[in-house]
């Protein structure tokens, strides 16, 4: 008679996350007596999933009756498979001996390979706002997947991204994976409403990739212009001065005003206009006294914006009968004191 | 590169419970079986278990009864404990990582650390 | 267990010249996947072994190619076709299909 064979018909087999997975097996002979099992990877270091004489093995049934009268049918289900389950599954023949059973034949093998869906990318951008014209980095992760092969893209404002690194781990054999991508991105001045995305595309999402966003709103600086101007008044003795603070972002604004260096007033910024870029607005006023000077006043609106360093802008108000509308106005960056260079009239 | 590095007593009275512990640096112990074989003085080399990463264990039977192989994946660190020690488990003692793939099983145990030498004696 | 026995037990050789050992296995090392469980490993003189070969016949990263191994089942070859002054140490052959891993006896290459 022929000597048995033990026949796995199905090289792979590839099954979704979660679902069951049924891996087929027979025997070409009812001898020699003995037990059937069946072990994940070969070798010294297989794993037994099912054995037919005893144990308990709570997600494994088999496809047909065991016990039936001249069964040759050993195959198995194996339920809720999760990418810890993916190998080389192999149905293994055993003779019956003494004291233990001796391994007959074993069928050629099927790998499970298990399809696995990436979770949702998380995209995070730099700790620290930069300035436009500065590169910023945005990183983008998904992890348990499986398959390894995974496509992802960067696109800002919908426009794709060609800046970018991407790594898949692990680099060798694994149940599942994770990928991580940096993207590195020009800021420009009208980013305060830019978004970047990550989209990542996998066989697992069948052509509907996962995307994972950041807003720029959250990685950016814009530093505030500043213009301090002096407007008409009908007292001869009394001076408006104001401080337009521009295009800033974010609102984070603290402006102090400075006569001749010292602090006549500090104020946050509370009510802003917004621009249609998401840039900020705002303006302040200081009415000076000239009859409490009997020289020349200079100025300062002086700007702390986002915890940066101050930059300020002072104005030159000329104390003099005939000239109460002239002045001269200096830009400069202030120090951590408070007082600032007095510029000269021009 | 990854690298393995033992560590224990030098010395361990007879009777007594010899420990060693294996760290791996430069690499992860996913996806590996983590090995201890052992070689007394001008002798060959002897299995004494391994260990996979998900904590699945595997021991030389003529050992078995006094072995235990433990791991711990946040020190990235695995340990080898032998009771009832006697001066014929004196001996230079390797761990090692072993490749494995699903599919294949075992192929190659590719890196060793240097060596660790514990003598039994009173 | 599987028994590994390994010949000779030692074997002086000269530079340049080649040199082959033999391992034999108590039982086939070939599984039903067509590989077989073999692997060997060179221990030079103070230090850890070094993987060689694995599965029979497959060259380990970073093993110059002057070594190769060949067999099937229970019969197994190691061959260094130019011996080095560096070859010198003790190679093992050490089966990887059941547990316990056993390794042969070792075969000690030396320079005549």
């Known amino acids: 008679e022929d000597e048995l064979q033990v026949i796995q018909p199905e090289k792979s087999v590839s099954v979704a996350a979660g679902e069951s997975a049924t891996l087929r097996c027979a025997m070409t002979s009812l001898i020699p007596v003995g037990p059937i099992m069946w072990f994940r990877g070969a070798g010294a270091g297989r794993e037994l999933i099912y054995n037919q004489k005893e144990g308990h093995f709570p997600r494994v049934t088999t496809v047909s009756e065991l016990t039936k009268r001249n069964n040759l049918d050993f195959s198995i289900s194996i339920s809720n498979i999760t990418p810890a389950d993916a190998g080389t599954y192999y149905c293994v023949k055993f003779r019956k001996g003494s004291p233990d059973d001796v391994e007959f034949k074993s069928g050629a093998g099927t790998e499970l390979s298990v399809r696995a869906k990436p979770s949702a990318p998380v995209v995070s951008g730099p700790a620290v706002r930069a300035t436009p014209e500065h590169t910023v980095s945005f990183t983008c992760e998904s992890h348990g997947f499986s398959p390894r092969d995974i496509t992802l893209k960067w696109f800002k404002n919908g426009n794709e991204l060609s800046d970018f690194q991407t790594n898949v781990d692990p680099a060798g054999d694994s149940v599942s994976y994770s990928i991580h991508s940096t993207a590195r991105v020009v800021l420009t001045r009208g980013d305060v409403h830019s978004q970047v995305i990550c989209e990542i595309a996998h066989i697992t999402l069948q052509g509907d990739p996962l995307r994972g966003t950041a807003n720029l709103s959250e990685a950016i600086r814009v530093p505030p212009t500043l213009e301090v101007t002096q407007q008409p008044m009908r007292a001869e003795n009394q001076a408006n001065v104001t401080c337009q603070v521009s295009n800033f972002y974010p609102r984070g604004l603290q402006l102090t005003w400075l006569e001749n260096g010292n602090v006549s007033r500090t104020e946050t910024a509370s009510t802003l206009i917004e621009n249609k870029d998401g840039t900020y607005n705002w303006m302040s006023w200081l009415l000076v006294n000239t009859c409490a000077h009997r020289d020349d006043v200079v100025l300062t609106c002086q700007v702390e914006h986002d915890g940066q360093q101050a930059v300020s802008k002072s104005y030159a108000l000329e104390i003099s009968a005939h000239q109460k509308e002239h002045g001269s106005d200096i830009t400069h960056e202030a120090a951590l004191a408070p007082t600032a260079p007095l510029g000269g009239s021009g | 590169q990854v690298q393995l590095q033992e560590s224990g007593p030098g010395l361990v009275r007879p009777s007594e419970t010899l420990s060693l512990t294996c760290t791996v640096s430069?690499?992860?112990?996913?996806?590996?079986?983590w090995s201890w074989i052992r070689q007394p003085p001008g002798k060959g080399l002897e299995w004494i278990g391994f260990?996979?990463?998900?904590?699945?264990?595997f021991y030389n039977s003529s050992l078995k009864s006094r072995v235990t192989i433990s791991l711990d994946m946040s020190m990235n660190q695995f340990s080898l404990k032998m009771t009832s020690v006697t001066a014929a488990d004196t001996a230079v003692y390797y761990c090692?990582?072993?490749?494995?793939?699903?599919?294949?099983?075992?192929?190659?145990?590719?890196?060793w650390g240097q060596g660790t030498t514990v003598t039994v004696s009173s | 267990d599987i028994v590994m026995t390994q010949s000779p037990l030692s074997l002086p050789v000269t530079p340049g010249e080649p040199a082959s050992i033999s391992c034999k296995s108590s039982?086939?090392?070939?599984?039903?996947?067509?590989?077989?469980?073999l692997d060997w490993y060179l221990q030079r003189p103070g230090q850890s072994p070094q993987l060689l070969i694995y599965l029979g016949s497959n060259r380990a990263s970073g093993v110059p190619d002057r070594f190769s191994g060949s067999g099937s089942g229970t019969d197994f070859t190691l061959k260094i076709s130019r011996v080095e002054a560096e070859d010198v140490g003790v190679f093992y052959c050490m089966q990887a299909l059941q547990t316990p891993l056993t390794f042969g006896g070792g075969t000690k290459v030396e320079i005549k």
């Open positions: 260990i996979y990463y998900n904590g699945r264990t």
């Open positions: 039982q086939s090392l070939l599984y039903s996947n067509g590989y077989n469980y």
């Open positions: 430069g690499g992860s112990i996913r996806n590996y079986y």
């Open positions: 090692a990582r072993v490749r494995a793939y699903s599919g294949i099983g075992l192929d190659g145990t590719d890196v």
